[in-house]
């Protein structure tokens, strides 16, 4: 025997109090699948959360975070404080990256500078709290007498023929 509730579409619920007829989900609730015996409560995007998508009778609300905070967890379940570049979030708040580490984003942790010497390269640009070091050619490539990469010939200007 077919369950009469299976005929209830998304956006409704099978109302046991009314002979299992399909009743619309009440305000602030939704059912995303058919055959539901109850509707789920809509999530409220309040305070630090902002509404990205309103709740409808067939789908839950979706939230994001107010400026200065970013989403964490599935479905933006939490909002974490942004820090500045060059900082990381600790239990005591935003703290500057320690020497030798950097963070080029407003979230996440400070990461160690790249160790150029591990790849046999030299440091071309020093690292900062906000930026990783830039590794250059290996020290051997820079020693006197070592063959260097020939720079490309300058492009000829139009209207000039070669001498």
């Amino acid at each position: 025997l077919q369950d009469p509730c299976s005929n209830c579409p998304a956006g409704t619920f099978c109302d046991n109090n009314r002979n299992q007829i399909c009743s619309p989900c009440p305000p602030n609730s939704f059912s995303s699948a058919g055959g539901q015996r109850t509707c789920d409560i809509c999530r409220q995007c309040k305070g630090v959360f902002r509404t990205r998508k309103e709740c409808s009778s067939t789908s839950n609300a979706e939230c994001d975070c107010t400026p200065g905070f970013h989403c964490l967890g599935a479905g933006c379940s939490m909002c974490e404080q942004d820090c500045k570049q060059g900082q990381e979030l600790t239990k005591k708040g935003c703290k500057d990256c320690c020497f030798g580490t950097f963070n080029d984003q407003k979230r996440g942790i400070c990461r160690p500078w790249t160790n150029c010497s591990l790849d046999g390269k030299s440091v071309l640009v020093n690292g900062t709290k906000e930026r990783d070091v830039v590794c250059g050619p290996s020290p051997a490539d820079l020693s006197p007498g070592a063959s260097s990469v020939t720079p490309p010939a300058p492009a000829r200007e139009p209207g000039h023929s070669p001498q």
């Epitope: 009440p26 602030n28 409560i41 999530r43 409220q44 309040k46 305070g47 630090v48 959360f49 107010t66 200065g68 905070f69 379940s77 939490m78 909002c79 974490e80 404080q81 708040g93």
Partner: antibody, heavy 118, light 111 residues
Framework: QVQLQESGPGLVKPSETLSLTCTVS????????WSWIRQPPGKCLEWIGY???????NYNPSLKSRVTISVDTSKNQFSLKLSSVTAADTAVYYC????????????WGQGTTVTVSS | QSVLTQPPSASGTPGQRVTISCSGS????????VNWYQQFPGTAPKLLIY???QRPSGVPDRFSGSKSGTSASLAISGLQSEDEADYYC???????????FGCGTKLTVLG
């Protein structure tokens, strides 16, 4: 299960600053709002303000100029400071945990009575 | 003066059904869900109903909540002497960006 415990002086002099701390035990402070509510003798409940675990705050406009709420996640505590108090600030002060997705206060401290008097 | 309006008192006899009303506006009850709290003398309020009509575990099904437009109500059926308490409605207010409360209804169980 999560429990909240308010602590702080029960007597504060007029014009001074009322300071209370709420200690959260049996659970994490992360992922929730944490509010301060007060109830003057024989009167209504009044929301003072809330702090989200990651530092977002909002205060009742009627008290905003005098209120600061802060959180210390490393100690699982949040605190209330109310400056320039008068006798009208005499009340039972409650701290609460507020669900962040559906906004209801599901855990309350037992309350602490603060009297403002010289 | 509270943002949400409740009658100051209500009463009923054991076994009766009583309802407590809560009236608000479009910025609170009209656009958000309603919660109800129960408070006994000398103790902290306790969550009784959340999201209009949801009962936390441990709350008897004699307690039910509903909402229509900018008003909400709490119904208590099969009234018992231990239901004598203060009942507060509350909800989020979008203009405040925070919660608002009613001033409470003192429920007396007669006889």
């Amino acid at each position: 299960q999560v429990q909240l415990q308010e602590s702080g002086p029960g007597l504060v002099k007029p014009s001074e600053t009322l300071s209370l701390t709420c200690t959260v035990s049996g659970g994490s402070i992360s992922g929730y709002y944490w509010s301060w509510i007060r109830q003057p003798p024989g009167k209504c409940l009044e929301w003072i303000g809330y702090i989200y675990y990651s530092g977002f705050t909002n205060y009742n406009p009627s008290l905003k100029s005098r209120v600061t709420i802060s959180v210390d996640t490393s100690k699982n505590q949040f605190s209330l400071k109310l400056s320039s108090v008068t006798a009208a600030d005499t009340a039972v002060y409650y701290c609460t945990r507020d669900h962040s997705h559906y906004y209801y206060m599901d855990v309350w401290g037992q309350g602490t009575t603060v009297t403002v008097s010289s | 003066q509270s943002v949400l309006t409740q009658p100051p008192s209500a009463s009923g006899t054991p076994g009766q059904r009583v309802t407590i009303s809560c009236s608000g506006s479009s910025s609170n009850i009209g656009s958000n869900t309603v919660n109800w709290y129960q408070q006994f003398p000398g103790t902290a309020p306790k969550l009784l109903i959340y999201s209009n009509n949801q009962r936390p575990s441990g709350v008897p099904d004699r307690f039910s909540g509903s909402k229509s437009g900018t008003s909400a109500s709490l119904a208590i059926s099969g009234l018992q002497s231990e239901d004598e308490a203060d009942y507060y409605c509350a909800g989020w207010d979008d203009s405040l960006n925070g919660p608002v409360f009613g001033c409470g209804t003192k429920l007396t169980v007669l006889g």
